[in-house]
Interface confidence: low
Amino acid sequence: KRFHDVLGNERPSAYMREHNQLNGWSSDENDWNEKLYPVWKRGDMRWKNSWKGGRVQAVLTSDSPALVGSNITFAVNLIFPRCQKEDANGNIVYEKNCRNEAGLSADPYVYNWTAWSEDSDGENGTGQSHHNVFPDGKPFPHHPGWRRWNFIYVFHTLGQYFQKLGRCSVRVSVNTANVTLGPQLMEVTVYRRHGRAYVPIAQVKDVYVVTDQIPVFVTMFQKNDRNSSDETFLKDLPIMFDVLIHDPSHFLNYSTINYKWSFGDNTGLFVSTNHTVNHTYVLNGTFSLNLTVKAAAPGPCPPPPPPPRPSKPTPSLATTLKSYDSNTPGPAGDNPLELSRIPDENCQINRYGHFQATITIVEGILEVNIIQMTDVLMPVPWPESSLIDFVVTCQGSIPTEVCTIISDPTCEITQNTVCSPVDVDEMCLLTVRRTFNGSGTYCVNLTLGDDTSLALTSTLISVPDRDPASPLRMAN
């Protein structure tokens, strides 16, 4: 059998196989050692007994989408049946005091591979026995502690495979410079040691995406905005836009990134090299926000040009083709077009990312202030409590609810939270009454809210001791 017979149904075209060469990966035309690595079809009854105590689940994730040329990383995590875990030696053991359907196990081991390997490798001092090989016959790499790695992972995509020895979790990174744009499929098959052979325990597949567009996400934050995810914001308060570029492999770390904003409110274009920008809308309505991100990213060098004329190229061309890797010695002459002829030279290509959102601007509560605090008359049964009226004003729209959070003087440990609907007239003046149990200093966070906004003010108040003999305190 060949790898492609074992690993996947999808057969990439000859073009795909030729143009998607992954560094360090092998062609799935290679032979698969079925004696050491048996192949079971989906639904084969043997899967049921491939693992003691249940089925192992493999979870495959990636940090897709990947900008073409960057690295994409795949992670596989094995999830064992209940009460099982991998120990420091790579053996699979039962967790202490964990009871599963079979009850508590007397044997601490599910699989004691340490004992197996000591038995089976005794015949040959090198440890390079005929069974310590991958499905294509390549020997296991002898990293320190490799004997504790008891799972074999075979990754398969684009007509190629990659083999890895590991524990219950592995990661593999692939450079996408030669990967066709668009969605691709990654499949992983996992085997476990079984004496001098291997047993399949899990198969998993996941889609990943390679793109020539910079993956851009924008977070929007505005003080007093009640729900930052609904793309509704408040008039007359700045909105902070923060651009997040999805670049987990740091491919663009040394790139100059430009951000070009159009806020849709006739304020023109705003160009910046900063990933954050503030903008205040002064009118209500619906606006179309557009962002274009431009980065000079490492990319393929252009084909060799015709022999250059003696005159020097324009600076802009020189800039476009300048060497990305500053450690690479420059070309012998001063003609930057020669860059394309230098082997392994990295050139730059402009990559773009786009973000568009429709945002709604509405009236909201812009500010809230406590203008007065008044001690209130308290009836005799509650000598320990103090009632305090907070007189509050606000600016902007009229609130429909009030919340008070009473906490310790550091404002960190919440003692009491009360929220209630309110009715306020156009003057936006209201009284909020709250109870304080006992004397001392309290931090009071008071928020006024309506459908779209939530405005906060804080104050520290000092509640005096009550004299039990005269429990009544008159309000001012």
């Epitope: 009226d389 609907p421 009715d423 009284t431 909020v432």
Partner: antibody
Framework: QVQLQESGPGLVKPSETLSLTCTVS??????????WSWIRQPPGKGLEWIGY???????TYNPSLKSRVTITRDTSKNQFSLELSSVTAADTAVYYC???????????WGQGTLVTVSS | DIVMTQSPDSLAVSLGERATINCKSS??????????LNWYQQKPGQPPKLLIY???TQGSGVPDRFSGSGSGTDFTLTISSLQAEDVAVYYC?????????FGGGTKVEIK
């Protein structure tokens, strides 16, 4: 101690206007964060909120009765009142006035007064 | 309007036994993570008396045997050990939205 007391005629003719007053003692009806409500309960049935007047004077009515209801207040007497026009037999009920504490719940109720609509 | 539906309509429980009353709202009455749901007890010829507010907070002077639970649209009033004086009609009420609305009531009797 806060107390509420309803007063008004116990019998009203159909198509006429029902008028009730709630006298509050122990607290001013202009004290911040309180609302003063009218709630009714037909004999053997459940409770229905009619409307309330805020400490600030703002009034809110139940939409189902809005066209027929008027709530007013007299801060000098510490009273608030209910008028329900064009009454029918379906308006026969025990009418309660109540205080709504910080918009959470009705914590103080009057004893209620039975108003019968009959000719 | 938010419609409040109580079940059962009536309930007969032996003295000392547990009584459970359910209240369901037509839409969520949670606000800031707090259930704006109150429970009242009404005895014949008397006005309702507050038992529980904010879904689970006991009103002043309410015996510990009364407790409330629930969130969103489903709430429960529990009387852990029924006493003779607990014979009454119990109402739930939402205060999240205007108009405040009450459930139809559950009559609790001694079996």
């Amino acid at each position: 101690q806060v107390q509420l007391q309803e007063s008004g005629p116990g019998l009203v003719k159909p198509s006429e206007t029902l008028s009730l007053t709630c006298t509050v003692s122990g607290i001013s009806i202009t004290t911040g964060n309180y609302r003063w409500s009218w709630i009714r309960q037909p004999p053997g049935k459940g409770l229905e909120w009619i409307g309330y007047i805020y400490y600030s004077g703002t009034i809110t009515y139940n939409p189902s009765l809005k066209s027929r209801v008027t709530i007013t207040r007299d801060t000098s007497k510490n009273q608030f009142s209910l008028e329900l026009s064009s009454v029918t037999a379906a308006d026969t009920a025990v009418y309660y006035c109540a205080r709504d504490l910080t918009h959470w719940y009705f914590d103080v109720w009057g004893q209620g007064t039975l108003v019968t609509v009959s000719s | 309007d938010i419609v409040m539906t109580q079940s059962p309509d009536s309930l007969a429980v032996s003295l000392g036994e547990r009584a459970t009353i359910n209240c369901k709202s037509s839409e969520s009455v949670d606000y800031y993570g707090i259930g704006f749901l109150n429970w009242y007890q009404q005895k014949p010829g008397q006005p309702p008396k507050l038992l529980i507010y904010a879904a689970s907070t006991q009103g002043s002077g309410v015996p510990d045997r009364f407790s409330g639970s629930g969130s969103g649209t489903d709430f429960t009033l529990t009387i852990s050990s029924l006493q003779a004086e607990d014979v009454a009609v119990y109402y739930c009420q939402q205060s999240k939205e205007v108009p405040p609305t009450f459930g139809g009531g559950t009559k609790v009797e001694i079996k």
